[in-house]
Interface confidence: medium
């Protein structure tokens, strides 16, 4: 007799691990034999889908290799035309060992900001996520929390938060560990010890001291009156992320010295500054005509001509007096290569002593011009022929301004050593010395004996630079 279908074994919930086999059984009694169809989440499973096997006249559904997307409600429906169709449903729960789908990455963060180390996981049952710092489990506190997503959030990052981190995902089926990542905490440059201001006497040595810290360790640069320090010696040491810089200066002029500590954070820099003034006791502004200061000669061209450690006048009408005056002698010096062997050393001595005049420090640094007699000795004794030629060329305007040659000095404008022996500078190597004779013969008493002259210069500037050439 015909009999309507009855499902004798209703579907049950099935648990299955990924890549395992899962089977649903739907035993049906009926006559005639029913047609059995299967659905997943109300979508018909096609008989020819190779991921499934349907056997025993449709009563057994096998998923051959479970994927996590197979999760859902499976129903079987039996119908044989007698009575209504019958249905039974059961769930497939795909069980999954923990898997870290978005692992943490190395992070560099500036102290005080918020850091988030990601750790997104998959798994069934849902894994719990914890974190390890170094070798120990990380304890959550007011600044540190593991978010619902598994990520680690650290508010107001501190230096002590730096270190190695890994996340751990755990469920009943297993445990997964991320790779170890590094949290680096960078700290803005900060000055721990600022340089102190000093009031010193002219020509004394001063050491300015500046200490800074930061991560990475900052570099320290010194600025003098807005420009990089060009003189002085700098000593630096680094210990425990603290950099200590000492600038030793030979003081010949007042100045504002700034210590700048800088470190880099990615493409950006952080900077901290501290300044100190160095003033000179009884220092007054130089007179209008003599704008400049005294300093030891540190150049190259004249150091065989000028006295060792000579104090010379540097003219601040140039942006960079040392550089400008050195360039001046350099160019003129090369022109002297063609003069006679008798003239050349005398002219070199005159050149160097003119451009780098002896300097009287005093209250107002003052250049000391060369004595007229020495200038005349070069002009009329050693370099008479060359001097004449040079005067002629100068008057005819044959010297190009680019050559910035010195024009012919007017010896008559220089002070005489007979007026005031301290008011003008002698050229010692032009003086004949009987015990140590140089290449030049002694002169008559009307003129000083001369040996290796240099070029003079005074506030009345008997030598002048071609005005069209700018040294600044």
């Amino acid at each position: 007799l015909p009999k309507a279908p009855v499902i004798t074994t209703p579907l049950e919930t099935v648990d299955a691990l990924v890549e395992e086999v899962a089977t649903f059984m739907c035993a049906v009694e009926s006559y005639p034999q029913p047609e059995i169809s299967w659905t997943r989440n109300k979508i018909l499973i096609k008989l020819f889908d190779t991921r499934y096997s349907i056997r025993e006249n449709g009563q057994l559904l096998t998923i051959l290799s479970v994927e996590d997307s197979d999760d859902g409600i499976y129903c079987c429906t039996a119908n044989n035309g007698v009575g209504g169709a019958v249905e039974s449903c059961g769930a497939l729960q795909v069980k999954m060992k923990p898997k870290i789908t978005r692992p943490p990455i190395n992070v560099k963060i500036i102290e005080g900001l918020k850091a988030v180390l990601p750790c997104t996981t998959m798994g069934n049952p849902k894994p719990s996520v914890s974190w390890i710092k170094g070798d120990s489990p990380l304890r959550e506190n007011s600044r540190t929390a593991v978010l619902e997503s598994g990520s680690l959030r650290i508010h107001n990052v501190q230096k002590e938060d730096a270190g190695q981190y890994r996340c751990v995902a755990k469920n009943s089926l297993g445990t997964a560990y991320s790779k170890v990542v590094k949290l680096e905490v960078e700290v803005f440059a900060r000055i721990l010890r600022a340089p102190e201001s000093h009031n010193v006497t002219f020509g004394s040595f001063v050491t300015l001291h500046c200490t800074a810290t930061g991560i990475p360790v900052p570099t320290i640069t010194w600025i003098e009156n807005g420009n990089a320090v060009s003189s002085g010696s700098i000593q630096e040491s680094v210990k425990d992320r603290v950099i200590d810089s000492r600038l030793q200066l030979f003081i010949t002029k007042p100045g504002l010295y700034t210590c700048i500590a800088t470190n880099k954070h990615g493409e950006k820099f952080s900077t901290a500054k501290a300044a100190a003034t160095v003033s000179i006791a009884e220092w007054s502004k130089p007179q209008k005509d003599n704008k400049g200061y005294c300093a030891q000669y540190r150049g190259e061209v004249c150091n065989a001509v000028l006295a060792k450690d000579a104090l010379v006048f540097l003219n601040t009408s140039y942006a960079d007096p040392e550089e400008a005056q050195e360039l001046l002698v350099h160019t003129a010096w090369n022109e002297l290569k063609v003069v006679s062997p008798l003239c050349r050393p005398a002219a070199e001595a005159l050149l160097c002593n003119h451009v780098f005049q002896e300097c009287s420090p005093g209250v107002v640094p003052t250049p000391i011009p060369i004595c007229r007699e020495y200038c005349l000795a070069v002009k009329e004794l050693f370099c008479a022929k060359e001097w004449l030629a040079m005067e002629e060329k100068t008057h005819r305007g044959l010297y190009r301004s680019e050559m910035h040659l010195l024009s012919v000095p007017e010896c008559s404008k220089l002070p005489s050593m007979h007026w005031d022996p301290t008011a003008c500078a002698r050229l010692p190597h032009l003086d004949y010395n009987k015990e140590n004779p140089k290449t030049f013969p002694p002169m008559t008493s009307s003129k000083p004996s001369v040996d290796i002259p240099n070029l003079p210069s005074s506030s009345s500037s008997s030598f002048s630079v071609s005005p069209t050439y700018s040294m600044t």
Epitope: N227, A228, S230, G299, E300, V301, N303, A304, D320, E323, E326, L327, H330, T331, W333, N334, R400, E402, M403, Y469, S470, M471, T472
Partner: antibody
Framework: ELQLVESGGGLVQPGGSLRLSCAAS????????MSWVRQAPGKGLEWVSA????????YYKESVKGRFTISRDNAKKTLYLQMNSLKSEDTAVYYC??????????????WGQGTLVTVSS | QAVVTQEPSLSVSPGGTVTLTCGLS?????????PDWYQQTPGQAPRALIY???SRLSGVPSRFSGSFSGNKAALTITGAQPEDEADYYC????????????FGGGTKLTVL
Amino acid sequence: ELQLVESGGGLVQPGGSLRLSCAASGFTFDDYGMSWVRQAPGKGLEWVSAIPWNGGSTYYKESVKGRFTISRDNAKKTLYLQMNSLKSEDTAVYYCAKRSGRIAFGALDAWGQGTLVTVSS
Amino acid sequence: QAVVTQEPSLSVSPGGTVTLTCGLSSGSVTSSNYPDWYQQTPGQAPRALIYSTNSRLSGVPSRFSGSFSGNKAALTITGAQPEDEADYYCALYMGSGSRNYVFGGGTKLTVL
């Protein structure tokens, strides 16, 4: 005749050292500044270092500071370049050149033929 | 650090005039940079042509001259010869303590 002859180049491994020499003749060596200039294969000229007539100061391109040392022996009329901690980017022909005056700068008015330095592992 | 800029390549007909320039990536070239010009032919060491803007070295033909053009230094070859085909480098002095001497990238001059 003025001559500058470089020597001391060759193949060296990264991190290694070489000392280049430049023998000068035909001019008053101790009255002129000197320089080293290099040229990487197929590239332009690059100033490396300079020294004035008396060796009283030295100047270097930023990238070689602390690794290279320029010096001179006026008695031997020889310029030197001691190169330490060499890197592959130091591979070049190294020219010795005479400055136009005593100072460490000024036009390079005479050049040697160069010596090849190859830094490679 | 400022970069010294030059035209990568230029060409000139024999007998023609060509001007090569030398600038700074930031700012102008001034007389305080003492522009120098060098010529280098393949396989040879460089040779100085002009120093301090416009002073010709001895033995350099008068067709080579130096000057300023706007905010750049310039090398002009008047009446170019086939033997002038070469690489030309300008170099600038970057003074104030460091005394750096910086070469430009060079200009390849072709005499067609």
